[in-house]
């Protein structure tokens, strides 16, 4: 931004500048250019020997300026366009200035003035241009400063040129008030802080409803000596509930929200939320819908899922395979997991209780992501009820549960009762029994044994009878032995695991049961 302190052309001849000597040399004249009257100070004493004609401006108040720019528009006639070349003719003039705290009026003293420069034209007006009224306008600019007094004068010294001053404009530069990155920077005088620091650092203030981002830098700009803003640093962002519209922050419209200070616009309230008011930072969930703590505010509100679909329990001897399908209503979420709980009831007494401790699951029964699980080690003659609950990220926000149950009765054989009949250093003779009523259902018995402490290998023997001798064993070694009935339906209940020890080579005949 240029702040004009003096503009001769704009004053349309109303500025009465001082000429010295009075009535000679410089002269205010009017001409017509482009059908418009223009005023100029001119002098053309090119055949009268040495000249020293001065033209001094009126006193110019400095205002806040430290450095001023002087723009001159002028025309100079070619000395060769005059007869005989006008021997004393010159084609330059001199520019001076003087600072003062008061206006000296008509008191003009050359010695008070300091020369700024000799002003020479880039283009002179030759005869043909003069006759055709082609004004060869030259533009020259000079900078003066730093200025310290209240005001100043400019002066033009003619030394024998044919020159016309059409425009004298004196101005200083300001970096204009500016909005940048939602920060307001004040109008700033363009000054060099020092020769090594030609930029003035100016702090901006965030516009209404804008803030400096957390951990970010406040807005800064640099004002150059040329009155231009450079190198923005930092920024302001519209605060929560407001979005950037041109150079301002505007409240989010009803039905929209913005949860944090950011560059992003307000977002439409997601599904299953209540319509927000103006300037909302979030949108409340509809009744029955919820947001998990980790859910972004831009996500739709969701609800717990419905119960799993089509739960089936398929009995396979002492095992049950549970299968189900995903809930019809996921609640709008993908993070569904399943939990399986088990209850067993004794048919004789009708007594029931949890059975988590006595059964084995093919994978941990809580936070299942698959839709099937196998439960083994079920006891015979027992009624089991399995509940499969579907849960998602918002299930913990409600007390109700979404589950489906399936019951199954275990009719498989009781576990065989096993005992050690005999033993030696290399063999163990094992016998077992089951109730007579169940014997018809047994197809074979499966005896599994291994050295205690050796989890990597085991041996299996099948037999139709109620006893087996396990040979080729190591002396003085404890073996883990389990007997399980095999029925048409699959595996029956297994006996508990027994520990039997072979005799040592010098050992006694004591037996461990």
């Amino acid at each position: 931004k240029e702040v004009v302190l003096l503009d001769f052309a704009a004053m349309k001849g109303e500025l009465g500048w001082l000429t010295h000597p009075y009535g000679k040399g410089w002269d205010l004249m009017q001409n017509i250019m482009d059908d418009m009257p223009i005023y100029m100070y001119s002098v053309c004493n090119v055949v009268s020997g040495d000249q020293d004609n001065w033209l001094r401006t009126n006193w110019v108040y400095r205002e806040e300026a430290e450095r001023i720019f002087i723009e001159l528009k002028f025309t100079v006639r070619d000395c060769n366009s005059f007869p005989g070349g006008a021997s004393s003719c010159k084609e330059t003039f001199n520019l001076y200035y003087a600072e003062s705290d008061v206006d000296y009026g008509t008191n003009f003293q050359k010695r008070q003035f300091t020369k700024i420069d000799t002003i020479a034209p880039d283009e002179i007006t030759v005869s043909s241009d003069f006759e055709a009224r082609n004004v060869k306008l030259n533009v020259e600019e000079r900078m003066v400063g730093p200025l310290t007094r209240k005001g100043f004068y400019l002066a033009f010294q003619d030394i024998g040129a044919c020159v016309a001053l059409l425009s004298v404009r004196v101005y200083y530069k300001k970096c204009p008030e500016m909005l940048q990155s939602l920060a307001r920077f004040p109008e700033t005088i363009a000054v060099a802080v020092s020769d090594t620091q030609p930029l003035a650092t100016v702090a901006g203030t965030c516009v209404d409803h804008a803030v400096v981002p957390y951990g970010g830098e406040g807005p800064l700009m640099h004002c150059t000596v040329d009155g231009e803003w450079l190198v923005p640093i930092g920024q302001c962002l519209c605060q929560e509930g407001y979005e950037k519209v041109e150079d301002a922050c505007r409240a989010c419209s009803p039905g929209f929200f913005k949860s944090e200070a950011s560059e992003s616009p307000c977002l439409e309230c997601p599904e299953h939320t209540l319509p927000s008011t103006e300037g909302a930072t979030s949108c409340q969930c509809e009744e029955g819908y919820f947001r998990a703590p980790e859910d972004p505010l831009s996500m739709s509100c969701t609800r717990p899922p419905s119960a799993p679909n089509y739960l089936t329990a398929i009995g396979m001897g002492a095992k049950v395979e549970l299968r189900w399908t995903a809930p019809k209503d996921t609640g709008g979420r993908q993070d569904i997991v399943y939990s399986v709980t088990c209850e067993q009831c004794w048919p004789e007494s009708g007594e029931c209780g949890p059975c988590e401790a006595s059964v084995r699951y093919s994978e941990p029964p809580h936070a299942l992501t698959r839709t099937s699980v196998t439960v083994s080690d079920l006891e015979p003659h027992m009624n089991y009820t399995f509940a499969v609950e579907a849960r998602n990220g918002v299930s913990g926000l409600v007390t109700s549960r979404s589950f489906r149950t399936a019951s199954v009765s275990i009719n498989q054989t009781e576990p065989p009762k096993v005992r050690l009949e005999d033993r030696s250093t290399t063999s163990l003779s094992v016998t077992w029994s089951i109730p007579v009523s169940q014997q018809s259902r047994v197809w074979k018995y499966e005896v599994t044994y291994r050295k205690k402490g050796d989890a990597n290998s085991y041996n299996v023997r099948r037999t139709e009878g109620f006893s087996v001798t396990l040979d080729d064993l190591a002396p003085d070694t404890t073996y883990l032995v389990q007997v399980q009935a095999l029925t048409q339906e699959g595996q029956g209940a297994g006996s508990k695991v027994h520990e039997f020890q072979t005799l040592s080579t010098e050992g006694s005949a004591n037996m461990a049961v």
Partner: antibody
Framework: EVQLLESGGGLVQPGGSLRLSCAAS????????MAWVRQAPGKGLEWVSR????????HYADSVKGRFTISRDNSKNTLYLQMNSLRAEDTAVYYC?????????????????????WGQGTLVTVSS | DIQMTQSPSTLSASVGDRVTITCRAS??????LAWYQQKPGKAPKLLIY???NLHTGVPSRFSGSGSGTEFTLTISSLQPDDFATYYC?????????FGQGTKVEIK
């Protein structure tokens, strides 16, 4: 020394035509703006027409516009005024006048010109 | 067109007198004004241009002043050769109009 010598004047009937000539010497004719100025008997001066150093532009007074034509031949150092449809009010002494910008000690040319050099004039009489 | 009005139309003076002739323009012509001298049966002669600039070879007793609409031609000390008719001419517009003339005669 600058010399301008007009010729071609005389008596002519209204509606008739006449061609005036102005022979120039003692200066560089092609540098000069040239003009015709007339003076009716016992009256003041009236500018008639002008022509630029190279033959253009040309200007005319409203009273002669469309009837008179100014021209020049720089190779012959001669200025002309072709006068058609002459009227009684055109009766006057016609002066050839010249202007050289080199003698105009001003920084910017005036909107028009004045006349530095004059011929002795030639009389044109329009009468029936 | 710009009208130029001279006053007086006739002026009687004696040798050695200071003589002033006035020329008024119907609108501002800045300083674009010339003064001419004409003797009977002769061509006009240029005296002054741009209101105050003396033409080459013109005696310094002649001077011109003024700007805008009011102009004067001054003969500081009238000489026998100066008895003639004087015309002003504006060249601020293409019409280049002359004043009606001021006749300076012997008193």
């Amino acid at each position: 020394e600058v010399q301008l010598l007009e010729s071609g004047g005389g008596l002519v009937q209204p509606g008739g035509s006449l061609r005036l000539s102005c022979a120039a010497s003692g200066f560089t004719f092609s540098h000069y703006m040239m003009a015709w100025v007339r003076q009716a008997p016992g009256k003041g001066l009236e500018w008639v027409s002008r022509i630029g150093p190279s033959g253009g532009p040309t200007h005319y007074a409203d009273s002669v516009k469309g009837r008179f034509t100014i021209s020049r031949d720089n190779s012959k150092n001669t200025l002309y005024l072709q006068m058609n449809s002459l009227r009684a009010e055109d009766t006057a002494v016609y002066y050839c006048a010249g202007y050289d910008s080199g003698y105009d000690y001003v920084a910017v040319a005036g909107p028009a010109e004045y006349f530095q050099h004059w011929g002795q004039g030639t009389l044109v009489t329009v009468s029936s | 067109d710009i009208q130029m009005t001279q006053s007086p139309s006739t002026l009687s003076a004696s040798v050695g007198d200071r003589v002033t002739i006035t020329c008024r323009a119907s609108q501002s012509i800045s300083t674009w004004l010339a003064w001419y001298q004409q003797k009977p049966g002769k061509a006009p002669k240029l005296l002054i241009y741009k209101a105050s600039n003396l033409h080459t070879g013109v005696p310094s007793r002649f001077s011109g002043s003024g700007s805008g609409t009011e102009f004067t031609l001054t003969i500081s000390s009238l000489q026998p050769d100066d008895f003639a008719t004087y015309y002003c001419q504006q060249y601020n517009s293409y019409s280049r109009t002359f004043g009606q003339g001021t006749k300076v005669e012997i008193k």
